[in-house]
């Protein structure tokens, strides 16, 4: 069953800056992501950004930059102009639509205990996006490495070791987490097998696109910049969550920039490559 996770992060260097990270753990092909605040989209929430895997992104103040991080996760940077920092008490929701199967949404907020002065130690948890063998191998190595490091710390410094938890921390940012999986079994968050599914749809899908969204030009594929660039390299500087991909996507970030009617396309907009034969040509 699909899962949606939401994580809200406050920048330690700029206390007025927030980033919302969202991801989809499921077998479907994402057709649209909507980020809202104040509640779920369509249920009292206000849209902050809409990210379409082909047509680009559209955002509204106070959203500063919305972008795809991987084929199944996005991030939205927010600029809090108010001195009272209203974001600290705001609920952010992310809705992942997989047309026509359904839409899944989850919400999260900045934990009230967030204190920029207390920086949590980095917790290396990789984004698992490679094949299953890579996943298992990488996990084993990292777990062993973490265990060994903790063992050394325990022996040498004789002090309690920090509890491992998913987070987005590095030298630049303090992560304040809002872990909000969907109501499906939480076992999927701990057991990679729980989110591995076969192809969601057969090759005979009868899915048509609107005439209003004309066929899009194809440009040379480009690789994403930043920590999500490599699908085979673990991200150690920034903790993340287990994200088992469907296996039918191409490498993360292979997204030619496109524009569509009424959509503002940002330079770093990228997302899942359309997979023909699953939901038709997008």
């Amino acid at each position: 069953t699909p899962e949606v996770w939401v994580q809200v992060q406050m920048e330690a260097t700029e206390l007025s800056s927030f980033t919302v990270h969202c991801g989809f753990l499921g077998p479907g092909s994402i057709s649209l992501v909507t980020v809202s605040w104040g509640g779920p989209d369509g249920a009292g929430g206000t849209k902050l950004a809409v990210l379409h895997p082909e047509l680009g992104t559209r955002q509204w103040a106070p959203a500063r930059q919305a972008r795809w991080e991987t084929q199944s996760s996005i991030s939205l940077a927010l600029e809090d102009s108010g001195a009272s920092s209203p974001f600290a008490n705001t609920t952010f929701c992310c809705k992942f639509a997989s047309f026509p199967e359904g839409s899944w949404e989850s919400c999260g907020s900045l934990p009230p205990s967030s204190d920029p002065g207390l920086s949590a130690p980095p917790t290396p948890v990789p984004i698992l996006r490679a094949d299953l063998a890579g996943i298992l191998g990488l996990s084993g190595v990292l777990l062993f490495g973490c265990g060994y490091l903790l063992h050394l710390l325990r022996r040498q410094k004789h002090r309690p070791t920090p509890r491992l938890q998913p987070s987005h921390t590095n030298s630049q940012a303090l992560t304040a987490q809002a872990w909000a999986p969907s109501q499906a079994s939480q076992a999927a968050l701990h057991d990679p097998y729980a989110t591995i599914n076969t192809s969601f749809c057969p090759a005979t899908l009868d899915t048509a696109h609107p005439n209003g969204w004309a066929s899009l030009p194809t440009h040379a594929a480009h690789q994403p910049q930043g920590p999500a660039a490599s699908a085979s390299t673990p991200i150690l500087a920034r903790g993340s969550f287990v994200s088992v991909e469907n296996g039918l996507y191409t490498q993360a970030g292979e997204r030619p920039p496109h524009t569509g009617p009424g959509l503002t396309l940002f330079p770093d907009c990228r997302g899942p490559r359309a997979v023909e034969g699953r939901f038709g040509v997008r």
């Epitope: 699909p2 649209l32 369509g42 809705k95 047309f99 969907s182 109501q183 005439n211």
Partner: antibody, heavy 122, light 106 residues
Framework: EVQLVQSGAEVKKPGASVKVSCKAS????????IYWVRQAPGQGLEWMGT????????SYNQKFRGRVTMTRDTSTSTVYMELSSLRSEDTAVYYC???????????????WGQGTLVTVSS | QNVLTQSPATLSLSPGERATLSCSAG?????LHWFQQKPGQAPRLLIY???NLASGVPARFSGSGSGTDYTLTISSLEPEDFAVYYC?????????FGQGTKLEIK
């Protein structure tokens, strides 16, 4: 209050076409997909297709391929389902429904139209 | 298409009894939805994603299952529960419903 109001009953001859409307109110029309289900007398439910009201994308049951067309008019918050080349076995109640969004810790609700009876008879 | 087979076709029980309705898929599905339909009315979402209660649905309803076998359970039948129940899969196109289980008063 969320409402889906469908057009009235229709009697059609074999080979003709029928266009059923579904007018939505009480929510932002483009925030939710609409799907169509039909139910022949005394029979079960049959999914016909889904339309994404925000971008007009559609997905149809291949059983109706080439015969069904779903459209939407955002100015009137109305979705239309047209079925052509009607035959007697198309006699059924046709329902439109607002697709639900599965949201954690929030109520998940679906809404349905009252149904439109389409009778195909010579 | 993925055929969903519901059993039994008809279930005759009395108020207060426990009802168990089954839905078997021809091929594995990721999750299942259950709908309730009363005569002359449109269907109503009862359980989504296998085991989650839709808004306003009493806690006596529960769902379970995985793969190809799913179950809807009503712990203690109330008079208003007698209706037709349909399961639906959305794991592959076309989406399909089971043929329905009619729950009638004994």
């Amino acid at each position: 209050e969320v409402q889906l109001v469908q057009s009235g009953a229709e009697v059609k001859k074999p080979g003709a076409s029928v266009k059923v409307s579904c007018k939505a109110s009480g929510y932002t029309f483009t925030d939710y997909w609409i799907y169509w289900v039909r139910q022949a007398p005394g029979q079960g439910l049959e999914w016909m297709g889904t339309i994404d009201t925000s971008d007009h994308k559609t997905s149809y049951n291949q059983k109706f391929r080439g015969r069904v067309t779903m459209t939407r008019d955002t100015s009137t918050s109305t979705v239309y389902m047209e079925l052509s080349s009607l035959r007697s076995e198309d006699t059924a109640v046709y329902y439109c429904a607002r697709d639900f969004i599965i949201t954690v810790n929030y109520p998940v609700v679906d809404y349905w139209g009252q149904g439109t009876l389409v009778t195909v008879s010579s | 298409q993925n055929v969903l087979t519901q059993s039994p076709a008809t279930l005759s029980l009395s108020p207060g009894e426990r009802a168990t309705l089954s839905c078997s898929a021809g091929s594995s599905v990721n999750y299942l939805h259950w709908f309730q339909q009363k005569p002359g009315q449109a269907p109503r979402l009862l359980i989504y994603s296998t085991s989650n209660l839709a808004s306003g649905v009493p806690a006596r309803f529960s769902g379970s299952g995985s793969g190809t076998d799913y179950t809807l359970t009503i712990s203690s039948l109330e008079p208003e529960d007698f209706a037709v129940y349909y399961c639906q899969q959305r794991s592959s196109l076309p989406f399909t419903f089971g043929q329905g289980t009619k729950l009638e008063i004994k």
